[in-house]
Interface confidence: low
């Protein structure tokens, strides 16, 4: 049968097995979770994208699967990222009351995952899938991350990190969904700081990345919000992440592994 | 605290089937899954799969799929294994065994385990 | 399926001394900084016992003489000092994926 073809690459094989024993999974070691039933999960995860045109995906059509997700995270617990997911989920697993989006349950559903349906029929297209630049943006993946993340971003409280990767040539970047979704979806009502980790990638990088243009604009946009931004360098992401795991080590300095703070009003 | 308590042994003929029950106490049972494992004479130990009590989801081992079906009971508390079609290799003893972790789950309550001997 | 190689198949050792057994996958078992590794002991006609979690993290009521380390796709398990009652089986156990998979087991035995 004739499908459309797109540029990007087809739902992720197994993706209805997958999304099952992975809800299975969490529920199942989640003890707040465990009134989820996850066919009910999968059924609106489905619904949300099985025989829809998947260039024409609504942040609606996900509405009933957060509504079954509904998740909240304690003050001062939230870790955002951008473009360093690997370093923060490293992060999260060894300070465990900390959560980024992948460790709530509809982001560790979909994590790494592609997904996309057709126009009237009820297949799941594993062929191919609507590329955010050359096919469209509404498509079924971008939309889901766009509406979880705003969630997120929404009922998040107290002290806000952000987890930034310095080596990259924009720290900040406004096109990120961190600074078009997440940045824009802070509640100044409820958060009282973002403070931003800026992650440096060489060794003997001794640079404050803190005083980057990017990171300024950052701090511009949040102190428009009405949001204080306070940033910090993490010039050695491994000694950190040991420092976390063991905060007692003697080389462990006082602080987040000999970072320097910058306070912003 | 949590308990697993497993059916008494089996000796079963060669082509029938058996099932074994594991019956759970001192948690909700429909909050977590519970896995079988296998243990041949000899031969160390096999992941054969779990079930999902709160909605019966399964995932099995492909090994073992087609031949074991793992079912529950919720209000009973009991899980259940059956293994169809037995040969002489299926002569093992049969534990269940829940999770407990963190994110990712290991092996923290066991059944006694059930011995089946599958007759000629 | 990821295959687990423990050594040696047997240890024959005296109280009082150290057993360090050895576990390596076929592939790397890490994921976002954990090994997905775990160690079980048993002893005939019982369940196995967790030991150790996520490679090196020691089970409630485990003692101290019991230690796990490793990364990627090589694990161990040190026992030291021996006591009498630590003469058993010892699993390895990997659940990064599906199916998860147990070692052939090392047999650790009073000489």
């Known amino acids: 049968r004739w499908r459309q073809q797109w540029s990007g690459s087809g739902t992720t094989s197994r993706f209805p097995e997958t999304v099952l024993a992975r809800c299975v999974k969490y529920t199942e070691v989640h003890p707040e979770m465990r009134h989820v039933d996850c066919q009910s999960v999968w059924d609106a995860f489905k619904g949300a994208f099985i025989s829809k045109y998947p260039c024409n995906i609504t942040e609606e059509d996900y509405q009933p699967l957060v509504k079954l997700g509904t998740q909240t995270v304690p003050c001062n617990k939230t870790l955002l990222w951008s473009r360093i997911k690997d370093l923060a989920h490293q992060f999260t697993q060894v300070q465990r009351d900390m959560f980024t989006l992948e460790d709530m349950l509809l982001g560790y559903l979909a994590d790494d995952l592609t997904w996309c349906g057709e126009f009237n029929t009820f297949e799941i297209n594993y062929q191919s899938c609507p590329d955010w630049r050359k096919d469209c943006s509404n498509n079924p993946v971008s939309v889901f991350w766009k509406t979880v993340s705003r969630r997120f971003a929404e009922t998040a409280c107290g002290v806000v990190h952000v987890m930034l990767n310095g080596s990259r040539s924009k720290i900040f970047d406004k096109n990120s969904t961190f600074g078009s979704v997440e940045v824009h979806n802070l509640q100044p009502e409820k958060v009282q700081a973002l403070e931003a980790w800026v992650i440096h990638g060489g060794r003997e990088d001794s640079r404050d990345l803190c005083q980057d243009p990017t990171i300024k604009e950052l701090e511009s946009i949040i102190s428009k919000r009405n949001i204080r931004f306070f940033c910090k360098n993490i010039y050695r992401p491994d000694k950190f992440l040991q420092c976390v795991k063991n905060p007692e080590d003697s080389s462990c300095l006082s602080g987040i592994s000999a970072s320097h703070h910058h306070h912003h009003h | 605290q949590v308990q697993l308590v497993q059916s008494g042994a089996e000796v079963v003929k060669s082509g029938a089937s058996v099932k074994v029950s594991c019956k759970a106490s001192g948690y909700t049972f429909t909050s977590f899954n519970m896995h079988w494992v296998k243990e041949a004479p000899g031969q160390g130990l096999e992941w054969i799969g779990y079930i999902y009590p709160g909605n019966g989801g399964t995932n099995y081992n492909q090994k073992f799929q087609g031949r074991a079906t793992l079912t529950a009971d919720t209000s009973a508390s009991t899980a259940y294994m059956e293994i169809s079609s037995l040969r002489s290799e299926d002569t093992a003893v049969y534990f269940c065994?829940?999770?407990?972790?963190?994110?990712?789950?290991?092996?923290?309550?066991w059944g006694q385990g059930t011995l089946v001997t599958v007759s000629s | 399926d990821i295959v687990l190689t423990q050594s040696p198949a047997t240890l024959s050792l005296s109280p009082g001394e150290r057993a360090t057994i050895s576990c390596r996958a076929s592939e790397s078992v890490d994921s976002y900084g954990n090994g997905f590794m775990h160690w079980y002991q048993q002893k005939p006609g019982q369940p196995p016992r967790l030991l150790i979690y996520?490679?090196?993290s020691r089970a409630t009521g485990i003692p101290a003489r019991f230690s796990g380390s490793g990364s990627g796709t090589d694990f161990t398990l040190t026992i030291s000092p021996l006591e009498p009652e630590d003469f058993a089986v010892y699993y390895c156990q990997q659940n990064k994926e599906d199916p998860w998979t147990f070692g052939g087991g090392t047999k650790l035995e009073i000489k």
């Open positions: 996520l490679a090196s």
């Open positions: 065994a829940r999770t407990g972790g963190l994110r990712r789950a290991y092996f923290t309550y």
